[in-house]
């Protein structure tokens, strides 16, 4: 015998108190699939959470975070404090990156500057708390008598002779 509840569409529930008739979900609740015997309570986006999508009879509300915070976890289950660039979030709040490290985002950890010498290159631009170092040509390329670094010639389009 077919379950009469299987005919109840999303947005309704199978009401046992009313001979298994399909009743609409009450306010502030939803059912996202058919054949449900109860509707789920809508998520409330309170406090630091703000409503990205309102709850409907067939889908839950979706939250994100108020400015100054960012989402963490599945479905934005948490809001974590943003820091400034050049900082990282610690147990005691936002702290400046230590010398030799940087963070160019409002979240995440401070990362060590690139070690240019590992690639046989020199430091072209020093690092800061907010920016990584910029590596330049290798020291050998900069030694006296070495040819200066010149940009490559632009590629010529076919069929065009040089000016």
């Amino acid at each position: 015998l077919q379950d009469p509840c299987s005919n109840c569409p999303a947005g309704t529930f199978c009401d046992n108190n009313r001979n298994q008739i399909c009743s609409p979900c009450p306010p502030n609740s939803f059912s996202s699939a058919g054949g449900q015997r109860t509707c789920d309570i809508c998520r409330q986006c309170k406090g630091v959470f703000r409503t990205r999508k309102e709850c409907s009879s067939t889908s839950n509300a979706e939250c994100d975070c108020t400015p100054g915070f960012h989402c963490l976890g599945a479905g934005c289950s948490m809001c974590e404090q943003d820091c400034k660039q050049g900082q990282e979030l610690t147990k005691k709040g936002c702290k400046d990156c230590c010398f030799g490290t940087f963070n160019d985002q409002k979240r995440g950890i401070c990362r060590p500057w690139t070690n240019c010498s590992l690639d046989g290159k020199s430091v072209l631009v020093n690092g800061t708390k907010e920016r990584d170092v910029v590596c330049g040509p290798s020291p050998a390329d900069l030694s006296p008598g070495a040819s200066s670094v010149t940009p490559p010639a632009p590629a010529r389009e076919p069929g065009h002779s040089p000016q």
């Epitope: 959470f49 404090q81 005691k92 709040g93």
Partner: nanobody, 121 residues
Framework: QVQLQESGGGLVQPGGSLRLSCAAS????????IGWFRQAPGKEREGVLC????????YYADSVKGRFTISRDNAKNTVYLQMTNLKPEDTAVYLC??????????????WGQGTQVTVSS
């Protein structure tokens, strides 16, 4: 049951002071941080200040540094937001929340309903 209740709001002239209270009940107050947020008409909600369970302060808004301070009285299960040199742009509904940690809020944290602060001459 769990409750957070804000009080102390009202109408104050520019340059004046107010002290808001956030009274908690129904949970182990000492284990939780308390954060203050505010929402001005037609604007996004913004974080103001937070106090950790151990008493350390975290400023969320640079605009209140030097004017607002936060303290807690664990014996009274209450956190206080002392606001001085108030400006018209501080006008908002102020509400408190109780996360475990000032830097991270969960969707099941407790929140109050808010208290209105109006700064106007």
């Amino acid at each position: 049951q769990v409750q957070l209740q804000e009080s102390g709001g009202g109408l104050v002239q520019p340059g004046g002071s107010l002290r808001l209270s956030c009274a908690a009940s129904g949970f182990t107050f000492d284990d939780y941080a308390i954060g203050w947020f505010r929402q001005a008409p037609g604007k996004e909600r913004e974080g103001v200040l937070c106090i950790s369970s151990s008493g350390g302060s975290t400023y969320y808004a640079d605009s209140v540094k030097g004017r607002f301070t936060i303290s807690r009285d664990n014996a009274k299960n209450t956190v206080y937001l002392q606001m001085t040199n108030l400006k018209p742009e501080d006008t908002a509904v102020y509400l408190c929340g109780a996360p475990r940690d000032c830097s991270r809020y969960s969707s099941d944290d407790y929140w109050g309903q808010g208290t209105q602060v109006t700064v106007s001459s």
